[in-house]
Interface confidence: low
């Protein structure tokens, strides 16, 4: 019968010739008189056979992530009868792996919204880089993710390719962060190859900050002739956040004399100054009232930010008007 | 067939710097690294550094630590070497070489080469 | 003083055999793919032999690399007067985290 034994070549092999190994019948007792044939795809391309000794040699370079494996058939046959001396019978020679392929991020761009202020630990997005290497070969394609870019603010997980946040961030200082990730294979050690990818961190607004005044003190005039319900001035204040973190309502803290309101002008996030009682020069010719300032949606675990709602001081003056 | 085009000859004074360029074509420019080598007068070749044009990230040789920066510019498939502080002995021809997928794959493609010349 | 240490110079007659030979260490050649390079008088270096022991196209077939341990050497057979040039082994070194250059070997082809 056939005497088998494992065939493998290894990928990429240089030598213009390499033995891979020896077809044999146990019933050669090495006096030439038998045939060694190949056959199959592959046969007399990619494989020759020696057709005395049944060595078969590979004489082109194999590259497994295109065919790991050739299924063969081989021949003997006895020169003196030409007669089959064995049945037809078929093989594998496997094509064995060596590290020619570099980790690949398939789903790049990658790109992830986080919660400014998100505690550490907190995670961001998954990456996962793929090996055309044969994973059953040793480190060929086992993958250890690192962080070539974005400390302090954020690490990966070195066997899962998990961003996580490793430091609180503050949009209002920075709102978006590049982070690049590298894959090595080889578990990391020499000779391994390694992609990277680029993530795009972009921050979401918490609403951190209050509205504060622009100014703490402002001044306006009214004349005594001007109806209820005038608009006498304006005054403002700025908010870091963004979007509805940054709506805010105004109101009057303090007005004695109940002379005066404020509305909020939603479009500008102005405080306009309302005249709500007409006055009198003659009876009153200044006025200082005090308002403040409060964001409009304001979440419940984020009022630490918001204790001392800002306040600032309108002095308004009257004008005299002659009256007949 | 891969191309890099250095930028011309520089004449420089001591204390000085120079910023020499490297513009690569037909190939996917974000994909390979790039080293900078230099050559001084009837000598060796000496690394200067790597840099990979996607991410920016860099690896400098440490005898230019400090003294050198390598930047890339993807809309123009450009890099760039800028060397300070120059002084007689960087006088060389620089030249950019186009590395692997990774940092250890060797240069397959080499520019012309830039002479940098420092004299006071 | 390079890591890579080469003989300053070789030299050979048309048609003989020249060995270059580049030693290094463990972090270098020991543990990296060793490439060679030739720079003909006046031009931009060119790759001659990468990842130890293959040939980019182009690149005759009388050129050949080979490496053992910390260790490598190229071999240039059937000696032609266009192989006159400098020639640099490079390799990629672990412990320096950066490449590495030979000294270089001149290599004359004496008539």
């Known amino acids: 019968g056939w005497v088998w034994n494992q065939f493998f070549v290894p990928e990429e092999m240089n030598t213009t010739s390499h033995h891979v190994g020896r077809l044999r019948s146990d019933l050669d007792n090495g006096n030439n008189s038998f045939q060694y044939k190949l056959l199959g795809a592959g046969a007399g391309s990619t494989f020759i056979i020696d057709e005395r000794t049944g060595d078969i040699y590979a004489i082109e370079k194999l590259d497994r992530e295109e065919r790991s494996l050739y299924i063969l058939r081989a021949q003997v046959i006895d020169i003196t009868t030409g007669r089959a001396v064995e049945p037809e019978s078929e093989f594998v020679i496997k094509v064995s792996d060596i590290n020619d392929n570099e980790p690949k991020f398939l789903d790049e761009p990658y790109e992830a919204i986080v919660p400014e202020m998100s505690p550490e630990g907190t995670l961001v997005i998954q990456v996962t880089a793929s090996d055309a290497d044969d994973p059953s070969s040793g480190n060929n394609a086992r993958l250890l993710y690192s962080l070539l870019q974005g400390q302090p603010y954020f690490s990966v997980e070195p066997t899962t390719g998990v961003i996580r946040i490793s430091s609180k961030m503050d949009r209002e200082l920075q709102d978006e962060y590049w982070v690049i990730i590298q894959a090595k294979d080889m578990i990391g050690q020499p000779g391994a190859l390694s992609g990277t990818t680029s993530v795009l961190i972009k921050l979401s607004d918490v609403n951190d900050n209050k509205p504060i005044f622009k100014e703490s003190l402002y001044r306006l005039t009214v004349s005594e002739s001007a109806p209820t319900g005038t608009s006498i001035g304006t005054i403002m204040a700025y908010d870091n956040d963004i979007g509805e973190n940054a709506e805010m309502d105004y109101s009057i803290e303090e007005d004695d004399s109940q002379t005066f309101d404020i509305i909020t002008n939603h479009e500008t996030q102005e405080g306009i100054v309302i005249l709500k009682k007409k006055v009198n020069f003659e009876h009153q010719n200044h006025y200082g009232i005090r308002a403040k300032v409060k964001n409009h949606h304001v979440d419940e675990q984020l009022m630490k930010y918001h204790t001392e709602a800002s306040t600032t001081f309108i002095k308004i003056q009257v004008e005299d008007v002659d009256e007949p | 067939q891969v191309q890099l085009v250095q930028s011309g000859a520089e004449v420089k004074k001591p204390g000085a710097s120079v910023k020499v360029s490297c513009k690569a074509s037909?190939?996917?420019?974000?994909?390979?690294?790039m080293s900078w080598v230099r050559q001084a007068p009837g000598q060796g070749l000496e690394w200067m550094g790597i840099?990979?044009?996607?991410?920016?990230?860099?690896t400098y040789a440490q005898k230019f630590q400090g003294r050198v920066t390598m930047t890339g510019d993807t809309s123009t498939s450009t890099v760039y070497m800028e060397l300070s502080s120059l002084r007689s002995e960087d006088t060389a021809v620089y030249y950019c070489?186009?590395?692997?997928?990774?940092?250890?794959?060797?240069?397959?493609?080499w520019g012309q080469g830039t002479l940098v010349t420092v004299s006071s | 003083q390079s890591v890579l240490t080469q003989p300053p110079s070789a030299s050979g007659t048309p048609g003989q055999r020249v060995t270059i030979s580049c030693s290094g260490s463990?972090?270098?050649?020991?543990?990296?793919?060793v490439n060679w390079y030739q720079q003909l008088p006046g031009t931009a270096p060119k790759l001659l032999i990468y990842?130890?022991?293959q040939r980019p196209s182009g690149v005759p077939d009388r050129f050949s690399g080979s490496k053992s341990g910390t260790s490598a050497s190229l071999a240039i057979s059937g000696l032609q007067s266009e192989d006159e040039a400098d020639y640099y082994c490079?390799?990629?070194?672990?412990?320096?985290?950066?490449?590495?250059f030979g000294g270089g070997t001149k290599l004359t082809v004496l008539s």
């Open positions: 070489a186009r590395g692997g997928i990774k940092l250890w794959l060797h240069f397959d493609y």
């Open positions: 037909r190939y996917t420019f974000t994909s390979y690294y």
């Open positions: 840099i990979h044009p996607s991410g920016g990230d860099t």
């Open positions: 463990r972090s270098n050649i020991g543990s990296n793919f």
């Open positions: 990842t130890n022991n």
């Open positions: 490079a390799v990629y070194d672990d412990s320096l985290n950066g490449w590495v």
